[in-house]
């Protein structure tokens, strides 16, 4: 560590004083301390010298010895004292600039350590300190406002009692700048944009920052905008608003557009789309199938999207058949909007009853025309099943009656027993009928198939079932003769259980 | 031994706010006093101010109107923000470590600032 | 309008020693210590001398300075042709209270 010579913390000397400061290092060393008037510097060897022959109030500081080649980077300081009877303060800034929450040291320097006790701060033209200004002083440093605020940016003086009566420094301007998180905060209005050539056509601009040094600007398709810029502050904050209007837009205005700002914290760009269009336009879609097929008792959502521009003038839902006259309540009917020209609308059809199978149509109006997109909603039903004994041609047989959608398929068991469904271990034989005839096939409705099982004797104590199943589910009928020599007697004869 | 390195746009409009940052590497920002000197093309050097880490400044009083100076330690760096430039103001900027008889040592590069529209 | 004022261009021949003059006032280098400074073509400025004849660690002593009442001196002895380069005074200023730069010398190596 250098070593100062005179070896004391602190000197006090008269103006016009000769001043001589020695710092001896083990290598070369150099002094610092505030930029100021009358010092002469000059190296010897291992040591510099710090002098002046005419010591002012302007000498007043500390200062500080390094050996810059010292990886410890040790120092030592000594601080110096003209003491001036006129002048009390030796201020070394015109100006302070901190970030908020940060402390403002105020660099007054007192020039004679007796003055400490009967020092204040107080603001230009006798003003008092704004409240909770929490502050402190050092008579080697000055005041320090501690955590500053951007209202506390005002001009200070500081003052020392001498004989009786107040004696004021030059002012120091304080700066407390607002922290700059981050670049400015953008919007660009709106976010997309569609017009028919020869419409006209806003789009703003707009960044804001809690300072005020920051640049803006608006370009197209690469290519800066000259637009005049409108400038505010509120909210604590600085605005910078560009507004583009164009009477009557055409096919080159069309493109990006993208709104740029930046300051020292760097840079943040929005983009939007600007799209010129001959006519209106009016477009349907949907993600889902139009054709779709559902369980009866479930619930199902109709999603259309609509892209238009301009707005829709009027939409709606109808159901079109073909069971009933009645509409889809409008309180079903959902429309969300996901942007400017996109739409979506929503049909809830909860619990879907048999009578609500059929088409559903999704109407929409703008300039450009109408426009439909019609849904086929066909309701799914697991089989039901009945079984009849009769005579076909002399031979009797059992019919299966089988009916729900999508076609069911038909299986035949015969198991031994008295039974309402037959298991494994009782079957005796099974038939397949790969081609039951289809007895009606109408759209939206069931599907009703029918098959045939030709039996020459019903043997008594044995089960008949019918077995019919589709992808929603199976159902079965079982039955069973009561009599032997059942084959001789008219059907009627015969208790069948479902 | 202390490096500077000044970064900030080379062109900048009339009326508009010229912004340089000056980097200190190989060396600590705290406890020295940092300026901006100035130098337009075929001129002679100007010095526009100084400013202490504690956030203490001086500045040139033909500029004082237009200076702002700021440092922010954690970064090692300090900067400098010009008002309302004018042609007048293009030169080449170079910012250094002012020692205590006021000289200047060591210095940055220098960026050149060219004001026009 | 410079505050010091230096003649705007010097010359000498290789070997040669050449002096670059510095005027002021009572105010900057009648009160206040002179500093010197090079700068070489198309570079930043280097500190020559400081403290009227300081050099720091480095620079030639080919390179001197001197001071008396309110004018200073550049003497560079030896000349080369490296030395060929624009030399600025500067000097403190009660006035200003802060650093005042001369117009600069134009050094040409014959």
């Known amino acids: 560590i250098p070593v100062i010579e005179p070896s004391v913390p602190e000197l006090v000397v008269k103006p016009g004083a000769t001043v001589t400061l020695r710092c001896v290092g083990n290598g070369s060393v150099e002094w610092d301390g505030p930029p100021s008037p009358h010092w002469t510097l000059y190296s010897d060897g291992s040591s510099s010298i710090l002098s002046t022959n005419n010591a002012t109030f302007q000498n007043t500081g500390t200062y500080r010895c390094t050996e810059p080649g010292d990886p410890l980077g040790g120092s030592a300081a000594i601080h110096l004292y003209v003491k001036d009877p006129a002048r009390p303060w030796n201020v070394l800034a015109q100006e302070v600039v901190v970030f908020e929450d940060q402390d403002a040291l105020l660099p007054c320097l007192l020039t004679d350590p007796v003055l400490e006790a009967g020092v204040s701060l107080v603001r230009v033209r006798g003003r008092p300190l704004m409240r909770h200004t929490n502050y402190s002083f050092s008579p080697w440093h000055g005041f320090t406002i501690h955590r500053a605020k951007f209202i506390q940016s005002q001009d200070y003086q500081c003052s020392a009692l001498m004989g009786g009566r107040k004696v004021m420094s030059i002012s120091i301007r304080l700066k407390v700048q607002k922290v700059i998180p981050g670049p400015p905060a953008l919007t660009l209005v709106p976010a997309e944009l569609v017009r028919i050539r020869g419409e006209a056509a806003q789009i703003v601009c707009s960044a804001s920052s809690v300072d005020v040094n920051f640049d803006v600007f608006l370009q197209h398709n690469n290519t800066k905008l000259a637009i005049p810029q409108q400038s505010d502050f509120h909210n604590n904050r600085y605005q910078k608003v560009l507004t583009l209007n164009l009477d009557q837009v055409d096919f080159q205005h069309a493109g990006n557009y993208s709104c740029v700002a930046s300051n020292v914290q760097g840079k943040h760009s929005t983009s939007m789309f600007f799209r010129v269009v001959e006519s209106a336009y009016l477009n349907l879609s949907s993600e889902q199938n139009l054709i779709q097929e559902v369980t009866v008792g479930e619930g199902l959502n109709l999603k259309v999207m609509v892209e238009a521009y301009p707005g829709l003038q009027g939409f709606n839902w109808t159901y079109l058949g073909p069971f009933s006259d009645h509409q889809p309540e409008p309180k079903l009917a959902n429309a969300t909007t996901k942007d400017t020209y996109r739409h979506t609308f929503t049909l809830s059809l909860p619990r879907l009853k048999p009578s609500e199978a059929g088409r559903y149509s999704f109407l929409a109006r703008n300039p450009g025309g109408w426009r439909a997109l019609t849904f086929e909603l066909t309701l799914r039903y697991p089989p039901e099943v009945s079984v009849i004994w009769t005579f076909i041609n002399g031979s009797g047989t059992l019919l299966c009656a089988a009916s729900g959608y999508p076609q069911p398929n038909v299986t035949w068991l015969q198991c031994s027993g008295h039974t309402d469904r037959c298991d494994e271990a009782q079957v005796l034989q099974v038939w397949d009928d790969p081609y039951p005839e289809v007895l009606s096939q109408e759209p939206f409705h069931k599907v009703t198939v029918q098959s045939l099982l030709t039996v020459e004797t019903l043997e008594h104590n044995q089960t008949y079932e019918c077995r019919a199943h589709n992808s929603v589910g199976s159902g079965s009928w079982a039955f069973i003769p009561i009599s032997a020599g059942a084959h001789t007697h008219p059907p009627d004869e015969f208790l069948f259980t479902p | 031994q202390v490096q500077l390195q000044e970064s900030g746009p080379g062109l900048v409009k009339p009326s508009e706010t010229l912004s340089l940052t000056c980097t200190v590497s190989?060396?600590?920002?705290?406890?020295?006093?940092w300026s901006w000197i100035r130098q337009p093309a075929g001129k002679g050097l100007e010095w526009i101010g100084r400013?202490?880490?504690?956030?203490?400044?001086n500045y040139n009083p033909s500029l004082k109107s237009r200076v702002t100076m700021s440092v922010d330690t954690s970064k090692n760096q300090f900067s400098l923000k010009l008002t309302s430039v004018t042609a007048a103001d293009t030169a080449v900027y170079y910012c250094?470590?002012?020692?205590?008889?006021?000289?200047?040592?060591?210095w940055g590069q220098g960026t050149l600032v060219t004001v026009s529209s | 309008q410079s505050v010091l004022t230096q003649p705007p261009s010097a010359s000498g021949t290789p070997g040669q020693r050449v002096t670059i003059s510095c005027s002021g006032s009572?105010?900057?280098?009648?009160?206040?210590?002179v500093n010197w400074y090079q700068q070489l073509p198309g570079t930043a400025p280097k500190l020559l001398i400081y403290?009227?004849?300081q050099r720091p660690s480095g620079v030639p002593d080919r390179f001197s300075g001197s001071k008396s009442g309110t004018s200073a001196s550049l003497a560079i002895s030896g000349l080369q042709s490296e030395d060929e380069a624009d030399y600025y005074c500067?000097?403190?200023?009660?006035?200003?209270?802060?650093?005042?730069f001369g117009g600069g010398t134009k050094l040409t190596v014959l």
């Open positions: 250094a470590r002012e020692r205590i008889t006021s000289f200047f040592d060591p």
């Open positions: 190989d060396g600590s920002i705290s406890s020295y006093y």
């Open positions: 400013i202490y880490t504690s956030g203490s400044t």
């Open positions: 009572s105010s900057n280098i009648g009160s206040n210590t």
């Open positions: 403290s009227n004849n």
């Open positions: 500067a000097a403190w200023d009660d006035s200003l209270n802060g650093p005042v």
